[in-house]
Interface confidence: medium
């Protein structure tokens, strides 16, 4: 807490400008009007305040807005955002995607901090669902964002938002998350033709049930081994040798290299040796 001291004569700040960087912390506290700061927040980023000086500016805004900052101030926080605690952010009502982008920009290149996680949570809850524009923005800044959500949170993602998802956004998703996302993706891409559909649905297939894999095997999709290895074991086990051969197409030879790993290992053990021999790969059940 900065103690209250009178502003020295002639030091009262008429505006937010570079001269303030040479003010000591107590001078900033005493000589900068909080309302002036709030209306000229956009200037703060153009001035190289030290981290300690930013503490004082935050303190002034906290006094002016004890119930939480208005969005007009939040949008221009810039580096001051790094000073906010999750508790501060929970008081905010952020509705504009532009405000969200401006604050994510400040944290760009760094891991998602508790502040950012709280901001995103507040924003998404305020919107009621994770719409396409929001998802587009969040995955652009944090490719792993989608996979950081619980299955319950993912259930609020409308199928239309799935169009914003890129394959790399799903890299760290576990089967429980893909179980939620796959049906949404299936719905989102349902009007696409065979080969285009497969390209889009491929990265979601870790949530696909057996019947959908069987259907894909009839469409000459040539699934690569990396995708096959991410399929649910319980969905792969009921597939016949013929169905797996059709599903993988020319990639079927890759089964040999993966024969000791799940789901291939478990699938092999379920097959008749005669059927496995038809592949000519030397797989032993």
């Amino acid at each position: 807490e900065v103690e209250k001291t009178a502003c020295p004569s002639g030091k009262k700040a008429p505006e937010i400008d570079e001269s303030l960087i040479f003010y000591k912390k107590w001078e900033l506290e005493a000589c900068v009007d909080a309302a002036l700061l709030a209306t000229q927040m956009d200037r703060v980023n153009a001035i190289p305040f030290t981290y300690e000086q930013l503490d004082v500016l935050k303190h002034k805004l906290d006094e002016l807005y004890p119930q939480g900052y208005p969005e007009s101030v939040i949008q221009h926080l810039g580096y001051l955002f790094l000073k906010m605690s999750p508790e501060d952010i929970r008081k905010w009502n952020v509705t504009s995607l532009e405000t969200l982008k401006a604050l994510l920009e400040v944290n760009k290149g760094h891991e998602m901090s508790p502040q950012v996680a709280t901001l995103i949570d507040r924003f998404v809850k305020g919107r009621g669902q994770l719409d396409k524009d929001t998802l587009d923005t969040l995955t652009a800044f944090y490719p792993g964002y989608l996979c950081s959500l619980s299955p319950e949170e993912l259930s609020s993602v409308p199928p239309s938002s799935i169009w914003a998802v890129r394959p790399q956004d799903l890299d760290t998703c576990d089967p429980r998350q893909l179980d939620v996302l796959y049906p949404k993706a299936r719905l989102a891409f349902q009007n696409m033709n065979g080969s285009e559909y497969f390209v889009k649905i491929q990265s979601f297939l870790g949530g696909a049930p057996t019947e959908d894999l069987k259907a894909l095997s009839q469409q000459n999709v040539s699934m690569d081994l990396a995708t096959f290895m991410k399929l649910r074991t319980d969905a792969v086990l009921p597939l016949t040798v013929a169905e797996v051969q059709k599903l993988l197409g020319p990639h079927v030879e890759g089964l040999k290299a993966e024969e000791r790993h799940r789901p291939v290992r478990d699938w092999i053990l379920r097959q008749r040796q005669d059927d496995l021999d038809t592949l000519g790969l030397g797989l032993q059940g």
């Epitope: 040479f22 153009a46 001035i47 190289p48 030290t50 981290y51 300690e52 930013l54 920009e105």
Partner: antibody, heavy 120, light 107 residues
């Protein structure tokens, strides 16, 4: 990989001026303040000043006001420091250094340094 | 200006030692202190920021402590590659200022 590549060593005569460059790569140049620091023999590091590439605004250590001028060229992601009216006191190694507000206002990445020798 | 005083210009050490380098600010700087390592012919490298936070990739044998006016950089298990100059810096207020440096040498 972040990199701050500074221009090569300079040998200049007293009274002349010199302009040292610092080219940034591997990160968004306009997102980070750029500082300049002097390291002279027998002395510690001295902070010269800082410039905000996004706005071109700069602030100087009073000791270097009038001696150093900081500028940036956003299009080439390059920061410059011009030193004028050079004397032997200006002979030193000069560093550009990125200031990342995420890490307080510490200088998280430094150029390799430019050696300036002022001699007649 | 805030003066950062590193009272020991040189410190003799051996591999495996616990080394503590001190830095004193002429006025309260809170935790706005960073520590840098500089090896001969190289530029300084950030080790510690905000007095006690280890920068990305810095080995955990380096720890920073202190607040207000007194700060310490500790190397818990000295390695030969740690022989270098160490500088403290305050960024509480302008102008930013550095300590004179402490050089670690082998006994």
């Amino acid at each position: 990989e972040f990199q701050l590549q500074q221009s090569g060593p300079e040998l200049v005569k007293p009274g002349a001026s010199v302009k040292i460059s610092c080219k940034a790569s591997g990160y968004s140049f306009t997102d980070y303040n750029m500082n300049w620091v002097k390291l002279s023999n027998g002395k510690s590091l001295e902070w010269i000043g800082v410039i905000i590439p996004n706005y071109g605004t700069s602030s100087y250590n009073q000791k270097f006001k009038g001696k150093a001028t900081l500028t940036v060229d956003q299009s080439s992601s390059t920061a410059y420091m011009q030193l004028n009216s050079l004397t032997s006191e200006d002979s030193a190694v000069y560093y550009c250094a990125r200031w990342d507000n995420y890490y307080g206002s510490s200088l998280d990445y430094w150029g390799q340094g430019t050696t300036l020798t002022v001699s007649s | 200006d805030i003066v950062m005083t590193q009272s020991q210009k040189f410190m003799s050490t051996t591999v495996g030692d616990r080394v503590s380098i001190t830095c004193k600010a002429s006025q309260n700087v809170g935790t706005a202190v960073a520590w840098y390592q500089q090896k001969p012919g190289q530029s300084p490298k950030l080790l510690i920021y905000s007095a006690s936070n280890r920068y990305t990739g810095v080995p955990d044998r380096f720890t920073g402590s202190g607040s207000g006016t007194d700060f310490i950089l500790t190397i818990s298990n000295m390695q030969s590659e740690d022989l270098a100059d160490y500088f403290c810096q305050q960024y509480s207020s302008y102008p930013l200022t550095f300590g004179a440096g402490t050089k670690l040498e082998l006994k």
